[in-house]
Interface confidence: medium
């Protein structure tokens, strides 16, 4: 009779993570009598996966009933496969011996490759806000995929970016891999509503790339522009001065009015109006009692935006003469863009 052969018909098996791997093995003879064992790897460091004779192997089930006397099918199924299960599996026939069974014949081995999906890409931006015209860096990370081959792309508002660097680790063989990419993005004043997207494509995703996003609203700071204007006289001795704070983001803003360098009023932006581009406008006004001043008045609108150093704009009220009586204010003469003569 021909000597027993152990046949593993599949050179390789490809399984998705989480699924069940079937490793096929048959023997050509019932003789010699003895159990089958499955190992991952060869040599002294090999790992026991299944022992027909003894042991507890909760993830392993046999395809056929190994207790039947004429059984020659020693195929096994390994459940809930992870990338760590990748490797070459050997079906090994042992001959019954005393006191220990003796290894008799091994199959040629089946290489188990595990396909694992990448995790959802996580995009993170800079820790501190930056202003338009500055270049900021975004990072994208995804982990746990196999095989190593992967594609990563960056987009800003749907337009593909080219200024980025990507690394896949580790460089050598591994059960699973990670990808790390850094993209550089130049901010513009219109970027409050913009998005940066990192897209990862992998064989396991089958045409459905994974995307991670970052909103530039969390990255950008658009500093305000200030304009101080004098409104027509509201009452005989009162002048209304407004400070227009335009096109700022984020909303966090505090405004202080100074009269000749002395704090007159401080307020926080509350009822702002939003522009189409996502920036905000706000207006504050100050009612100045001219008769209380003997000299010219320098009005300053000072704005502290998002914790940045204050910016300011000034306006001069020129007090040229004082009324002899309360009711003798008659007119306001415009002598320049920032100057008013009050009579």
């Amino acid at each position: 009779e021909e000597e027993l052969q152990v046949i593993q018909p599949d050179k390789s098996v490809l399984v998705a993570a989480g699924e069940t791997a079937t490793l096929r093995c048959t023997a050509t003879s019932l003789i010699p009598v003895g159990p089958i064992q499955w190992f991952r790897g060869a040599g002294p460091g090999r790992e026991l996966i299944y022992n027909q004779k003894e042991g507890h192997f909760p993830r392993v089930t046999t395809v056929s009933d190994l207790t039947k006397r004429n059984n020659m099918d020693f195929s096994i199924r390994i459940g809930n496969i992870t990338p760590a299960d990748a490797g070459t599996y050997y079906c090994v026939k042992f001959r019954k011996g005393s006191p220990d069974d003796v290894e008799f014949k091994s199959g040629a081995g089946t290489e188990l490759s595990v396909r694992a999906k990448p995790s959802a890409p996580v995009v993170s931006g800079p820790a501190a806000r930056a202003t338009p015209q500055h270049t900021v860096s975004f990072t994208c990370e995804s982990h746990g995929f196999s095989p190593r081959d992967i594609t990563l792309k960056w987009f800003k508002n749907g337009n593909e970016l080219s200024d980025f660097q990507t690394n896949v680790d580790p460089v050598g063989e591994s059960v699973s891999y990670s990808i790390h990419s850094t993209a550089k993005v130049v901010l513009t004043r219109e970027d409050v509503h913009s998005q940066v997207i990192c897209e990862v494509a992998h064989v396991t995703l089958q045409g459905d790339p994974l995307r991670g996003t970052a909103n530039l609203s969390e990255t950008i700071r658009v500093p305000p522009t200030l304009e101080v204007t004098q409104q027509p006289v509201r009452a005989e001795n009162q002048v209304n001065v407004t400070c227009q704070v335009r096109k700022f983001y984020p909303q966090r803003l505090q405004l202080t009015w100074l009269e000749n360098g002395n704090v007159s009023r401080t307020e926080t932006a509350s009822t702002v109006t939003e522009n189409k581009d996502g920036t905000y406008n706000w207006m504050s006004w100050l009612l100045v009692n001219v008769s209380a001043h003997r000299d010219d008045v320098k009005l300053t609108c000072q704005v502290e935006h998002d914790g940045q150093p204050a910016v300011s704009k000034s306006h001069d009220l020129k007090v040229s003469a004082h009324p002899k009586e309360q009711g003798s204010n008659t007119a306001a003469e415009n002598t320049g863009s920032n100057e008013r003569n009050i009579y």
Partner: nanobody, 126 residues
Framework: QVQLVESGGGLVQPGGSLRLSCADS????????TGWFRQAPGKEREGVAC????????KYTDSVKGRFTISRDNAKKTVYLQMNSLKPEDTAVYYC???????????????????WGQGTQVTVSS
């Protein structure tokens, strides 16, 4: 290897409709991006439509846009091609194919697809 089987082809008059189906003998078609291709006599095989694994991404060749719709029912592990307003130039053998290796959905290159069915004949004639 995935074994694909197409059905639903036949003879139809211009302006008519047909619905092609593609199933997998091993019931694994829900795992793969899938495409429909066609080959007319004496012409090269061309991509018609393709659909990603989840069905959320689809692509069409320009000549069938607005007339053909690709869809999938992953519970039934089947991919469909609904063909409306058929023209004589749509006459061809239609093949279903699974893309087991690509990162992105592509219908243009049939070399990306590595598991094919035997094809079903679609003839548009009055």
């Amino acid at each position: 290897q995935v074994q694909l089987v197409e059905s639903g082809g036949g003879l139809v008059q211009p302006g008519g409709s047909l619905r092609l189906s593609c199933a997998d003998s091993e019931f694994r078609l829900d795992e793969y991006a899938t495409g429909w291709f066609r080959q007319a006599p004496g012409k090269e095989r061309e991509g018609v439509a393709c659909i990603s694994r989840s069905g959320s991404n689809t692509k069409y060749t320009d000549s069938v846009k607005g007339r053909f719709t690709i869809s999938r029912d992953n519970a039934k592990k089947t991919v469909y091609l609904q063909m409306n307003s058929l023209k004589p130039e749509d006459t061809a053998v239609y093949y279903c194919a699974a893309d087991l290796t690509s990162h992105y959905l592509s219908c243009s290159s049939y070399t990306d697809y590595n598991s094919w069915g035997q094809g079903t004949q679609v003839t548009v004639s009055s």
